[in-house]
């Protein structure tokens, strides 16, 4: 049975030509965490394995950078990274949890960070 | 099996810079984050920042900005720290360390710095 | 930036003897890592995500908490378990250490 939970940093906006954070935490579970995935919407942005450490994909390699932790910074942001950011972890024995993150892209000064939330 | 191997203690003045080297084997240096600990005896461990070897990011904690300088040089797997404008204040024990996403799992052996006036 | 506060600062415990330190945060974190650290040499990764044992640590060790209060824990007391233990947060930046325990055997 599926124990865990992913706790996000939920919907964030930030400036454009600015960075951001996003993490992910999975709780509630003893399993060991092999590998996590981060993708946006259908594309591949970085996998951190838990033998062979990071690996960002080629077309992110100036601007993603790994950490803190399991999490991920984007750099000089524009307004085409606006949208859907997904953690998948991968874990033994439960399987796979995925949370997911919503990033808004702004013109303005006018950034703020969304509450913390949980996907069970 | 991974390993960080520090350069050897420096007497520096007061005022000087001070370049210590971090050399990496036994894993892929570009695939981890490698970050760099001050130790004193007084003030214990105190995170200074880390590169990314992959593409050189850098992030550094604000108090050591301007201060400390990480760089990486991928042909010799190789980190670097400068240190400029020593002052006593900067007389301690500095570590390497690599980091995966799962806490600092390998340290090297620090590299021991005194500043004299 | 997180503080993280320590305590007790330095201890001592007979072998055999549970023993519990603690690590309290200045605002929430999401995990914890521990550090083990013996004079005259580097630190060394001990737990890692709250509650994981690093490779070659003995099972008699544990770790647990969240949000704010964490905790490592020996269940008996052995003599090659004397040393300085550090906690370390890397939830927010900068990543912070704490000021560390120092136990010592009875």
């Known amino acids: 049975m599926m124990t865990g939970t992913i706790e996000t940093t939920g919907n964030i906006s930030a400036e454009k030509g600015g960075s951001i954070i996003l993490q992910c935490h999975l709780s509630s579970t003893t399993a060991q965490v092999t590998q996590v995935n981060w993708e946006q919407q259908d594309q591949l942005l970085a996998i951190c394995n838990a033998d062979l450490g990071w690996h960002i994909s080629p077309s992110f390699k100036d601007r993603v950078a790994p950490g803190p932790g399991l999490g991920l910074t984007l750099q000089s942001l524009t307004v085409n990274d606006t949208g859907e950011y997904f953690c998948i972890y991968h874990t033994y024995p439960d399987g796979t949890y995925t949370g997911r993150i919503f990033l808004e892209v702004l013109e303005s000064s006018v950034a703020e960070h969304g509450a913390r939330f949980q996907i069970p | 099996q991974a390993y960080l191997q520090q350069s050897g203690a420096e007497l520096v003045r007061s005022g000087a810079s001070v370049k210590m080297s971090c050399k990496a084997s036994g894993y892929t240096f570009t695939s981890y984050n490698l970050h760099w600990i001050k130790q004193t005896p007084g003030q214990g461990l105190k995170w200074i920042g880390y590169i990314y070897p992959g593409n050189g990011y850098t992030n550094y904690n604000q108090k050591f900005k301007g201060k400390a300088t990480l760089t990486a040089d991928t042909s010799s797997s190789t980190a670097y720290m400068q240190i400029n404008s020593l002052t006593s204040e900067d007389s301690a024990v500095y570590f390497c360390a690599r980091e995966g996403g799962w806490a600092m799992d390998y340290w090297g052996q620090g590299t021991s710095v005194t500043v004299s006036s | 930036q997180i503080v993280l506060t320590q305590s007790p600062v330095i201890m001592s415990a007979s072998p055999g003897e549970k023993v519990t330190m603690t690590c309290s945060a200045t605002?929430?974190?999401?995990?914890m890592h521990w550090y083990q650290q013996k004079s005259g040499t580097s630190p060394k990764r001990w737990i890692y995500d709250t509650s994981k044992l690093a490779s070659g640590v003995p099972i008699r060790f544990s770790g647990s908490g969240s949000g704010t209060s964490y905790s490592l824990t020996i269940s008996s007391m052995e003599a090659e378990d004397a040393a300085t233990y550090y906690c370390?947060?890397?939830?927010?930046?900068?990543?912070?250490f704490g000021a560390g325990t120092k136990l010592e055997l009875k």
């Open positions: 370390q947060q890397w939830s927010s930046n900068p990543s912070t």
């Open positions: 605002s929430s974190v999401s995990s």
